[in-house]
């Protein structure tokens, strides 16, 4: 898009660039022990490493701003990793009324790009 | 969402905390005053500063992330500010026929939040 | 409706390695907290939890099991499926797959399939 | 692994009466979120089991109100208020608490 062309390979080394890894967490971890009952560990996959010029953009804002990083680098921060799409995830919880199963679409992260 | 409150003042002082902050740029700043022809200035919305903990979260995966990153910061990012929404921008450029009139969806930022 | 259908061979000879898929359809394998999960039956017996995998491709063994279980997941397909390795007679048995929150809350089964271990 | 014991083996019943089933752990089930990781499963004849309560004492979305599972710890019990016909096949306890969940042997039900 906008003469601007987002690149997939990273320029820094494998495992660098923003990708996405899974982390293991307790319900204790997220401070949710008092709440969800299952499951008691959560594979979480979030997005992780750098952004550099042009790799994985999500869109023409973050190819401008990977511009304007590499020419005022104090005022324009570089883009950053964050998640593109997300999976959801089945928690069994405690409700006023007893116990639920509720799907959250916005918790564990899919895809990722740099904003 | 979850537990967890995202909150909306900022505790590093004013200003330090993710925000909206426009940037002017020319269209040689962008690299694009071969296809732009108006506007030759533009000013360009961008989010950018801290995210610390809850502060402005997006959803409930940065609600984790900021938690996860207290516990474990070598391994998880904090939470970093991207746009939530943006405006839509006009720009005339050069096409093969001649000049035509293009709306951009994503080149401007309008709100931010921490993701 | 979330359903599960179970598929592979009936017959498998001693210390070959008995293969099982499970298809998954009206729902995405891709969910996080769900464990898809096999447990088997023997022949007029008792119900045991053979293992189980998450959509991220962690897996879970009943360490009874462990050194000769395989559970992979293909998302693309929504499969998963239970590789058990030299088997023998005692590995004679209905297989189930199911869908579990962690290691409870089996609330869809597979029909099961009959698994018969001889020369 | 924990091991699951049930009583009795075998409950013939009469259509219409109560019917209690007694699940036992090796060690308590009671984590301490306050709730008792113990499911119920009935397995009707030449069917795949299906889940009846979960956390002890709740019941399975579509599951009739005449089944209620309580006891807490180690003790567990199955209760079916009034028995229908189609309430016959084997039920199993399954204790969740910890990997690998284990299941008891299994109460037979059926009608006198």
């Known amino acids: 898009s906008a003469h601007l062309h987002p690149r997939d390979s990273c320029p820094l080394g494998p495992g660098r660039c923003c990708h996405l890894e899974t982390v293991q967490a307790t319900l204790e971890d997220l401070g949710w022990s008092d709440w969800v009952l299952s499951p008691r560990q959560l594979q979480l996959s979030m997005c992780v490493g750098e952004c550099p010029h042009l790799y994985r953009s999500a869109n023409t804002h973050a190819l401008i701003k990977a511009r304007l990083h590499g020419l005022q680098p104090d005022r324009v921060p570089a883009p950053c990793c964050v998640p593109s799409s997300y999976t959801p995830v089945v928690l069994m919880h405690r409700t006023d009324s007893g116990v639920s199963l509720q799907t959250y679409d916005d918790l564990v992260a899919q895809g990722c790009h740099c904003a | 969402s979850a537990h967890l409150h995202p909150r909306d003042s900022c505790p590093l002082g004013p200003g330090r905390c993710c925000h909206l902050e426009t940037v002017q740029a020319t269209l040689e700043d962008l690299g694009w005053s071969d296809w732009v022809l108006s506007p030759r200035q533009l000013q360009l919305s961008m989010c950018v500063g801290e995210c610390p903990h809850l502060y402005r979260s997006a959803n409930t995966h940065a609600l984790i992330k900021a938690r996860l990153h207290g516990l474990q910061p070598d391994r998880v990012p904090a939470p970093c500010c991207v746009p939530s929404s943006y405006t839509p921008v006009v720009l005339m450029h050069r096409t093969d026929s001649g000049v035509s009139l293009q709306t951009y969806d994503d080149l401007v930022a309008q709100g931010c939040h921490c993701a | 409706q979330v359903q599960l259908q179970e598929s592979g061979p009936g017959l498998v000879k001693p210390s070959q390695t008995l293969s099982l898929t499970c298809t998954v359809s009206?729902?995405?394998?891709?969910?996080?907290?769900?464990?898809w999960t096999w447990i088997r039956q023997h022949p007029g017996k008792g119900l045991e939890w053979i293992g189980a995998i998450a959509y991220s491709g962690s897996t879970y063994y009943n360490p009874s099991l462990k050194s000769r279980v395989t559970i992979s997941v293909d998302t693309s397909k929504n499969q998963f499926s239970l590789k058990l390795s030299s088997v023998t007679a005692a590995d004679t048995a209905v297989y189930y797959c199911?869908?579990?929150?962690?290691?409870?809350?089996?609330?869809?089964w597979g029909q099961g399939t009959l698994v018969t271990v001889s020369s | 692994d924990i091991v699951m014991t049930q009583s009795p083996l075998s409950l013939p019943v009469t259509p219409g009466e109560p019917a209690s089933i007694s699940c036992r752990s090796s060690q308590s089930l009671l984590h301490s979120n306050g709730y008792n990781y113990l499911d119920w499963y009935l397995q009707k004849p030449g069917q795949s089991p299906q889940l009846l309560i979960y956390?002890?004492?709740n019941r399975a979305s579509g599951v009739p109100d005449r089944f209620s599972g309580s006891g807490s710890g180690t003790d567990f019990t199955l209760k079916i208020s009034r028995v229908e016909a189609e309430d016959v096949g084997v039920y199993y306890c399954m204790q969740t608490l910890e990997a690998p969940p284990t299941f008891g042997g299994g109460t037979k039900v059926e009608i006198k």
């Open positions: 199911a869908r579990g929150i962690e290691y409870q809350h089996f609330d869809y």
């Open positions: 009206g729902g995405s394998i891709s969910s996080g907290g769900i464990y």
């Open positions: 956390l002890g004492s």
